[in-house]
Amino acid sequence: SSSPRSGALLRGCPTHCHCEPDGRMLLRVDCSDLGLSELPSNLSVFTSYLDLSMNNISQLLPNPLPSLRFLEELRLAGNALTYIPKGAFTGLYSLKVLMLQNNQLRQVPTEALQNLRSLQSLRLDANHISYVPPSCFSGLHSLRHLWLDDNALTEIPVQAFRSLSALQAMTLALNKIHHIPDYAFGNLSSLVVLHLHNNRIHSLGKKCFDGLHSLETLDLNYNNLDEFPTAIRTLSNLKELGFHSNNIRSIPEKAFVGNPSLITIHFYDNPIQFVGRSAFQHLPELRTLTLNGASQITEFPDLTGTANLESLTLTGAQISSLPQTVCNQLPNLQVLDLSYNLLEDLPSFSVCQKLQKIDLRHNEIYEIKVDTFQQLLSLRSLNLAWNKIAIIHPNAFSTLPSLIKLDLSSNLLSSFPVTGLHGLTHLKLTGNHALQSLISSENFPELKIIEMPYAYQCCAFGVCENAYKISNQWNKGDNSSMDDLHKKDAGMFQVQDERDLEDFLLDFEEDLKALHSVQCSPSPGPFKPCEHLLDGWLIR
């Protein structure tokens, strides 16, 4: 039931529009998407919100909304406005939000915006604005948010921005801006968010961001930058930086030394070849660092002071060694991907107590020592494929209670230690041509997927009769419970040529019943029969 006052309010609702009280004895009026070609005439003086978006309004007359002194939000988006005359918003003393996006404005309506002293949010995006007059925002002392994205700007309207000292967020994205001059935002000391993505920016003045002392988010993605934006060095409060999808070839030494608050840096899709060794130092808030294909990196980066890194990906470089103290710098590391490098020797990772995933495939590693992966209690996945590993210490994996995925394919193994691997669900040994011994399934009670060098080795896993097609399931089934991994026993693979064939086949029959769910490849078949097992045993 509505009060007499709200009933009176609703009687001032224009035809076809939807109206409701706003809880303060003022009226919210929704006239959107009604095909209107002009503003409704009988608006209540008590209107606080007026939505005229998605109509066919092509012009506003001077003073079209007389006496709406309580109006706080006016939406005119999605119309056909090409020009807004002086006086269009006269008398709107309370106006805080003005939405003019998705129209056909060719310049900022300077005169119409004069004296909107309460305006806090102005949307001018998705128009055809190519010109921003120098004084167009001069009366907007309260403006906090400004959208100028998706227009036709070719340069930063530096003069117009001088009066916006209260501005907190601005987007100039999706324009045709090609250069940012020095002090372009010199008076915007309250600005927290600045979006400049999807422009044509190819050069930055070396002091172009000076004055932006509150800036926390800077988006330079999808531009034409061919040099690292060193101008960011004055942004001491910067938390999020994006410059992905540019043409930057190198990141200099101490690149982010002026930005100690950085949490996120997005710089993928750049042809980065070189990164200064000190580039990522002293970033205590940084959690993720990803660098793929920087082929001129020969040394592991010095990450002093970047101790909270949780994920480090540095692939396709030419790193040949890791410092022995790598984990002292990175005690919180959970994911380490150093694949496609030239690593030969590995340090002990045991100080990296939080490591869950290590990817070292496609390196030059030849040996896994006893201390390399000791006591990594959280390690779930270890990829050592495509190396030159010939030797693995018998206890190299003995203290990895959470390990469920191990990839040692395409190495030079002739034997394989199983101590500590009883929790594995995924094991890859394919491509180790010298590894010809049979493997006992008893060591792997949790195993779901195994890939062996030879088909006959799959017979121990009950795959003789029905060839199992292994789809790419290596990365699936990562959620199994770790609760009882500590209860399982570990042992070494048994070399089967020490046993009578009959004994083996009896054992195998038992295994077959227990391991019907294991997927093993290459599957035995007509051209890779289990009978291959007999080859070396018929002659005694």
């Epitope: 309207p157 530096v158 002090y183 001491s236």
Partner: antibody, heavy 118, light 111 residues
Amino acid sequence: EVQLVQSGAEVKKPGESLRISCKGSGYSFTAYWIEWVRQAPGKGLEWIGEILPGSDSTNYNEKFKGHVTISADKSISTAYLQWSSLKASDTAVYYCARSGLYGSSQYWGQGTLVTVSS
Amino acid sequence: DIVLTQSPASLAVSPGQRATITCRASESVDSYGNSFMHWYQQKPGQPPKLLIYLTSNLESGVPDRFSGSGSGTDFTLTINPVEANDAATYYCQQNAEDPRTFGGGTKLEIK
């Protein structure tokens, strides 16, 4: 309140080395450029160079490049101007200043008088 | 380097009168809509004090008797009305390009 406090007056002989300091307080020291400006006795102002303490980025007036070095220690919010070999012509009052809006020199230290005489 | 020439080198003005100081640059100090000219006041035995930045913007705390104008190569500092404690040397400075340069100074005396 922003303050720049400079070290005291120095009297040196030609060929000697010297380092003078400028300690900033009341603002984020690493986020603003510190400039060095000199004023020879009875003369006008001359810009020597600047440093951004947060990044150790420096810009020098070519006239002074190689003769002076500008540095900073952000841990103690202090900028330095140093000479490895002073000349009599280095006699002047040296000011440090903190950058302001649009590269103006908004705050100034009290100045350090350096006298170089044999 | 951009050379800044101030004139006059000195002037004497009575309190309540207008003082006008000009600064001419050897090349334009305009860049992308901004004119990078600043004005400073220096009293004997004191460091300079910023009065006006970017040609015409009054620094906080500076009385509005001080004003600046100009663009390109020609700039003016005006003090109106002059007061007794305005006696000082006034310098213009450009930072459109490095090295930053100062004018030679204009000494204002109060009659």
